[in-house]
């Protein structure tokens, strides 16, 4: 029986979440990131879609840019030039990947508030960006870097050899883009513009993947992309350095791989640039437990890059990969060579350790059984950071200052008793010096955006609190939310359970486990959402649990490594058990648990259907991953290694989908993938559809022609609602 | 007022070992990354070690790793160099120092005690 | 990292200018600091970072340099200013010491 919701007059004038609420995105709230022009001014995309400067310290604030301006080229962004003459307009935005886009680029003059006439830019535009200093323009088009001193100037073509789907320079191809850089782009400015970074990918001899999209002509288009899945040829990368003052001069300069990288296949895995004649850049092995930051020194005389032996610095694991998700970036110190980076300390934690001569002697700055999460700035007398050490609650997130221009430094909780019970997990933004930041505050109360001075930590204003959120939300039984821990087998086991609005620990509901689980994730977060799952417990008296197992991340490497050549075990052993410890609390009604998850929870969620524990009646994979010989190298052989016999076939052959095709006979299986899926191919679920046919197993599929691996437009509609009419049949809930 | 004042020095045989002492007053000793220098008769300076405040990090200079052993104590405000199987070349005056944290993480030498002599000789 | 230290002594007269230079066998990024030793005292901290004085440290006295090569300036010399002269640097540990420099009155 369906608990009943209604329990008094007053809860009788609220209403329960629709599913209507949630494809509207009724419920959806605002953040606000400054986008900071100096030390105390910023920029901001007002109501009415003007561009208007503020200035902290004036309190006053001016349009640069009308709305009319922005409507005249139709642009849906913008971006000042450092010497604040010119704006680029970008209009016609047209997607591509995860974070690459095409546009057209229109430039316009704030001197005599006209667009720039003559030598314009080309269409469509891969990427575009101002250099740090001045108006330089550096953009890629066609595959090609160009180069413009001023944007009415003629371009300078600095590569020539760019082809589609073969070289890419200064963006990257698709899986640097999506497993390395996350990044639509592959080019650095040096911090006074002096110099341009910018990487070569060739994937000349990577395999294609071939999809068709269907469109509206008589025949499909096949979509070609050169995506090296685990174990097949990878891209090779080169890094160039050119001198944007006088390009035509030595051209661009190749910097050296260190010799302990180049010794096998590699990966380059980011550039930071330290002043303009200092650069460094990190390296990766194939096998990807071994880092290799190298400083790179500019040598007047011989005007190429020098890349000393004694500034190169090995980051190794030896208990799993190398990094988190990414391998951390360093933050430089204002002495121009020692540097703040995040990475395991003995105990098997991430902190922050201040680097100068060798890793071996590196300050530890921070520590504990919590891990530092990213470094926002530093300088002369701050170090900021954000962490989850308050409270000990991985799923939380609080912002920190260290004096580090004193001893010992002492250190500050910045954000730990602003708003305790609303805000618990904060990024921040910075403004040049850390004069003045950003909170940005995003649960698990409603979210909410604040402007701080960098020396006192005062607050000045509120950015954004989200009002008319909060005011919508006054009629709505909400569900409840409740963030805990089970202790198995020592290992913590956090989870977010979502429970109806007026639950009664004496009844029975039925259960939706929601997974992810994939390699250094976290699902179990203090954030506000109003959304699917939300619904799913608010309308029909469902209860949602998230469960953080093996395998995820910011609880130490114990929990992130275990899975390390092993994906598809403990990750579906530990949703599995939580299950259990579900059940035995009382309220779980037994028959009635469902298990659904999206990508890497796709996977989760398919191995735990066909686990034969019999816990699970249903269960939906969305664009699920079924053997991880069909994923991409960068991101698969991160945790699995190679797809050889001397290496980790065994387990790649192993931990299929399709090797279980027998045990989804006693569950209820619902299988979803976009036909156009770049990521995820639509290849992973034909497979185990084919399987469970050849097994004779029956099961329920959607495909979403032409769509990628979001589901995104009407799709979204479509795929909740059918999703949300597969779990209410499963537990017998009436439409 | 700052002052470092080194004692414990003087005549020991070939193979034997000493105890220096550094007593500290006039500034915050336990914050203060501290160090031994010493000067042969009619030579230059030469490193021998550093200790940073709370004794989790010594570090020395390579050829004198096994002999000597530095160590602090907070509460009595007292640094300590141990020396051990010393021979004729460790005939020197024994400087203790400390000084001022440097941002980003090191520190200069800028007070110096007068020094103590250490003469080896059978 | 060896610290070689140029000249090991000269002879100047009050009111001269003089220059010591010091080597690093590898870059030392600045990590450099100063030092004077007057006969029979302790020595004192003049410069750190490379070029930034100490406390007290009259503007007379001025350090530069980059990578390897350090140099320690004193303009218009002071008769106080004759005694023994030390470059160490503070990259990685041993934090060694260059041979010296003896100034002496002529």
């Known amino acids: 029986l369906r608990p009943s919701r209604v329990h008094n007059s007053e809860e009788n004038t609220m209403r329960a979440l629709t599913l209507k609420d949630i494809l509207n995105g009724t419920f959806s709230y605002k953040t606000f990131f400054p986008n900071w022009i100096s030390g105390q001014e910023y920029l901001h995309q007002s109501a009415d879609n003007n561009i208007v400067l503020y200035n902290i310290e004036t309190g006053q604030s001016y349009t640069i840019l009308s709305n009319r301006t922005m409507k005249s080229v139709n642009a849906s962004n913008y971006g000042l030039s450092p010497d604040r003459q010119f704006v680029y307009l970008e209009s016609d935005y047209s997607k591509l990947w995860r974070y690459s886009y095409t546009a057209t680029y229109y430039i316009y003059d704030l001197s005599n508030g006209e667009f720039v006439r003559g030598n314009e830019l080309p269409r469509p535009i891969q990427y575009l960006c101002w250099s740090p200093v001045g108006s330089k323009l550096a953009y890629v088009y066609q595959n090609n870097i160009y180069l413009k001193q001023r944007p009415g100037d003629p371009p300078f073509q600095i590569t020539f050899n760019g082809r589609e789907n073969k070289i890419f320079n200064g963006i990257p191809d698709w899986v640097y883009e999506e497993e390395m850089l996350a990044t639509k782009y592959a080019l650095w400015w040096s911090p006074n513009g002096k110099f341009l970074a910018y990487a070569e990918f060739n994937d000349t001899d990577i395999p294609v993947i071939a999809y068709s999209y269907y469109g509206d002509e008589q025949y499909p288009r096949t979509i070609n992309i050169p995506y090296p899945k685990a174990g097949a040829k990878n891209p090779v990368v080169r890094i160039f350095i050119i001198d944007t003052t006088y390009p035509a001069y030595v051209g661009p300069q190749e910097v050296p791989v260190p010799a302990m990288i180049a010794s096998s296949d590699y990966y380059f895995s980011w550039l930071t640039w330290v002043t303009d004649e200092r650069v460094c850049l990190q390296w990766l092995k194939r096998v990807q437990n071994v880092s290799v930051l190298s400083i790179c020194d500019f040598r007047e005389d011989w005007q190429t890059w020098d890349c000393p032996k004694t500034q190169e610095h090995i980051e190794e694991s030896r208990t799993g990969w190398a990094g988190g998700f990414f391998v951390s970036t360093p933050v430089f110190s204002y002495d121009a060579i020692s540097y703040y980076k995040i990475f395991s300390d003995k105990d098997g934690y991430k902190h922050i350790h201040y680097i100068k001569d060798t890793v071996e002697n590196a300050i530890q700055i921070t520590s504990g059984k919590w891990e530092a999460i990213n470094i926002f700035r530093v300088t002369q007398d701050s170090l900021f950071y954000s962490s989850n050490e308050f409270e000990e609650y991985p799923g939380r997130r609080n912002i920190y200052r260290i004096s580090i221009g004193s001893y010992p430094p002492s250190k500050k909780c910045v954000t730990c008793h602003l708003r305790k019970e609303r805000c618990q997990y904060y990024t921040a933004s910075f403004s040049d010096y850390a004069k003045y930041y950003a909170l940005v505050c995003y649960g698990p109360g409603i979210p909410i955006s604040t402007l701080h001075d960098g020396r006192t930590d005062q607050e000045i204003k509120i950015l954004e609190e989200n009002k008319e959120l909060e005011n919508a939300l006054k009629n709505i039984q909400l569900p409840k939310e409740e963030i805990k821990k089970l202790e198995v087998d020592e290992i913590t086991l956090w989870y977010k359970m979502i429970l109806p609005p007026q639950f009664d620990r004496s009844k029975k509901y039925p259960l939706l486990i929601q997974v992810y689980g994939g390699p250094c994730s976290q699902s179990v977060r203090s954030v506000f959402a109003v959304n699917w799952i939300s619904y799913l417990a608010s309308k029909e008296g469902m209860v949602i649990a998230l469960v953080d197992g093996r395998g995820t991340a910011f609880q130490g490497d114990k929990l992130l490594y275990a899975v390390y050549r092993k994906l598809g075990v403990y990750e579906v052993e530990d949703q599995i058990t939580a299950v259990r410890k579900f059940i035995e609390m009382g309220f779980i009604d037994e028959k009635r648990i469902a298990i659904w998850g999206w990508s890497y929870g796709g996977y989760v969620s398919s191995l735990a259907l066909a686990s034969g524990t019999g816990l699970f009646k249903c269960g939906i994979a969305v664009a699920p991953v079924s053997s991880w010989e069909y994923y991409a190298s960068v991101y698969t052989e991160r945790f699995m290694g190679l797809p050889t016999k001397d290496d980790n076939l065994e387990h790649y052959k192993n931990s299929t989908v399709m090797a279980r095709a027998e045990y989804f006979r006693n569950v209820d299986y619902l299988l979803i993938h976009g036909t156009a899926d770049d990521n995820v191919h639509f290849q992973n679920s034909a497979q185990i559809a084919k399987a469970l046919v050849n097994a004779q197993v029956d099961f329920q599929a959607m495909w979403y022609s032409d769509q990628n691996h979001g589901l995104s437009g009407l799709s979204t509609n479509h795929l909740y609602t059918h999703m949300t009419h597969f779990l209410k049949q499963c537990f017998s809930l009436s439409d | 007022e700052v002052q470092l004042l080194e004692s414990g020095g003087g005549l020991v045989q070939p193979g034997g070992s000493l105890k220096l002492s550094c007593a500290a007053s006039?500034?915050?000793?336990?914050?203060?990354?501290m160090s031994w220098v010493r000067q042969a008769p009619g030579k230059g300076l030469e490193w021998i070690g550093e200790?940073?405040?709370?004794?989790?990090?010594?570090n020395y200079t390579p050829s004198l790793k096994d002999k000597f052993i530095i160590s602090r104590d907070n509460a009595k405000n007292t640094l300590y160099l141990q020396m051990t199987k010393v021979r004729s070349e460790d005939t020197a005056l024994y400087y203790c120092?400390?000084?001022?944290?440097?941002?980003?993480?090191?520190?200069?030498?800028?007070?110096w005690g007068q020094g103590t002599t250490v003469t080896v000789s059978s | 990292l060896q610290m070689t230290q140029s000249p090991a002594s000269l002879s100047a007269s009050v009111g001269e200018t003089v220059t010591i230079t010091c080597r690093a066998s590898?870059?030392?990024?600045?990590?450099l600091a100063w030092y004077q030793q007057k006969q029979g005292k302790s020595p004192q901290l003049l410069v750190y970072?490379?070029?930034t004085l100490a406390d007290g440290v009259p503007s007379r006295f001025s350090g530069s340099g980059s990578g390897t090569q350090y140099s320690l300036k004193i303009n218009s010399l002071q008769p106080e200013d004759f005694g023994s002269y030390y470059c160490?640097?503070?990259?990685?540990?041993?934090?060694?010491f260059g041979g010296g420099t003896k100034l002496e009155i002529k």
């Open positions: 970072n490379a070029k």
């Open positions: 200790i940073n405040p709370d004794s989790s990090t010594v």
């Open positions: 160490q640097h503070f990259w990685s540990t041993p934090y060694t």
């Open positions: 120092a400390g000084g001022y944290y440097r941002y980003p993480y090191y520190y200069t030498m800028d007070y």
């Open positions: 590898g870059n030392i990024h600045n990590y």
């Open positions: 006039g500034f915050d000793f336990s914050t203060y990354w």
